[in-house]
């Protein structure tokens, strides 16, 4: 807090310009009019103020707008945004994507701060849903953004926004998140032809159910092992050896290297050894010949 002192003669700021970098904090407090600052915020970002000087400018804006800054000021905050607390940001009403971009630009190259997270939350809540343009912007600045949302928050993503998602945006998503995103992706890409569809849907397949995997196995997709290893175990278990062979195509040989890891390990345990032997990969651990397999889940459903 800078104590109130009278502005020295001849130092009253008539505009926000470079001469202010020579002002001490108390002089900025005394000699810069808050309303002038608000109307010339776009200039602040071009002036090399120290971090401490920015504290004073923020204090002046806080006094002028105790209920929260108007968007006309927010859009031009620039580096002053780094001085804002989440509490400050919760008072804002940010509706323009341009404002969001301008503030994200200031934080570019850094981890998502609590301030940025609050800003994004305010913006998305104000819009009511995570539309394509917003998602495009957020994932451009923070590739992991989508995977930071809860399944509940992801449910507000319209299928049309899925077009903005790149494979790397889903790298840190867990199965619960992919469960929500997969049906949206399926809907978004439904009118694409087989090979194009697979390219687009591939990164979302961690949320795919068995019946969709079975359908894909009929389309010569040649799924790579990395994608296969990310599939839901419960979706892979019911697949037959023939279906997995069709699904993976030439990549089926990779199963040998992954035979001790889920979901491959669990899938092997469910297959007849005879069937596994047809792959010629030396996969071991299947059900020996002559054993009867009881599907207890089916029995429970019938009783």
């Amino acid at each position: 807090e800078v104590e109130k002192t009278a502005c020295p003669s001849g130092k009253k700021a008539r505009e926000i310009d470079e001469s202010l970098i020579f002002y001490k904090k108390w002089e900025l407090e005394a000699c810069v009019d808050a309303a002038l600052l608000a109307t010339q915020m776009d200039r602040v970002n071009a002036i090399p103020f120290t971090y401490e000087q920015l504290d004073v400018l923020k204090h002046k804006l806080d006094e002028l707008y105790p209920q929260g800054y108007p968007e006309s000021v927010i859009q031009h905050l620039g580096y002053l945004f780094l001085k804002m607390s989440p509490e400050d940001i919760r008072k804002w009403n940010v509706t323009s994507l341009e404002t969001l971009k301008a503030l994200l630009e200031v934080n570019k190259g850094h981890e998502m701060s609590p301030q940025v997270a609050t800003l994004i939350d305010r913006f998305v809540k104000g819009r009511g849903q995570l539309d394509k343009d917003t998602l495009d912007t957020l994932t451009a600045f923070y590739p992991g953004y989508l995977c930071s949302l809860s399944p509940e928050e992801l449910s507000s993503v319209p299928p049309s926004s899925i077009w903005a998602v790149r494979p790397q945006d889903l790298d840190t998503c867990d199965p619960r998140q992919l469960d929500v995103l997969y049906p949206k992706a399926r809907l978004a890409f439904q009118n694409m032809n087989g090979s194009e569809y697979f390219v687009k849907i591939q990164s979302f397949l961690g949320g795919a159910p068995t019946e969709d995997l079975k359908a894909l196995s009929q389309q010569n997709v040649s799924m790579d092992l990395a994608t296969f290893m990310k599939l839901r175990t419960d979706a892979v278990l019911p697949l037959t050896v023939a279906e997995v062979q069709k699904l993976l195509g030439p990549h089926v040989e990779g199963l040998k290297a992954e035979e001790r890891h889920r979901p491959v390990r669990d899938w092997i345990l469910r297959q007849r050894q005879d069937d596994l032997d047809t792959l010629g990969l030396g996969l071991q651990g299947g059900i020996p010949n002559g054993y009867l397999v009881l599907d207890l889940s089916m029995q429970e459903a019938l009783s």
């Epitope: 002036i47 120290t50 580096y79």
Partner: nanobody, 116 residues
Framework: QVQLVESGGGLVQAGGSLRLSCTAS????????MGWYRQEAPGKERELVA????????NYADSVKGRFTISRDNAKNTVYLQMNSLKSEDTGVYYC?????????WGQGTQVTVSS
């Protein structure tokens, strides 16, 4: 991140002179707008005393006008502060800074003590 190393400080009698140097690790230094700041004591505000832009144009705080001269040698990636007619109120740690909006990195500073 650009490293800045200040040197040339020391103990000097009032009325004496010192020449401070600030060398930057960055190539392309000539494009940078540079400034010298003074901090009277730890925790106190750093005050800007002089700036020099890429074209060699200079500006000074009122308290040092006519006594201090800022200059640069782009070939050596160095900016200087020639301080003459030193006064006891010039005592403090002197820091140089690349005057770029959003850049708040400082060197370790160099101590200047003026005894009366």
């Amino acid at each position: 991140q650009v490293q800045l190393v200040e040197s040339g400080g020391g103990l000097v009698q009032a009325g004496g002179s010192l020449r401070l140097s600030c060398t930057a690790s960055e190539s392309g230094f000539s494009a940078n707008y540079m400034g010298w700041y003074r901090q009277e004591a730890p925790g106190k505000e750093r005050e800007l005393v002089a700036t020099i832009n890429r074209f060699g144009s200079t500006n000074y705080a009122d308290s040092v006008k006519g006594r201090f001269t800022i200059s640069r040698d782009n070939a050596k990636n160095t900016v200087y502060l020639q301080m003459n007619s030193l006064k006891s109120e010039d005592t403090g740690v002197y820091y140089c800074r690349i005057m770029r909006p959003g850049n708040w990195y400082w060197g370790q500073g160099t101590q200047v003590t003026v005894s009366s």
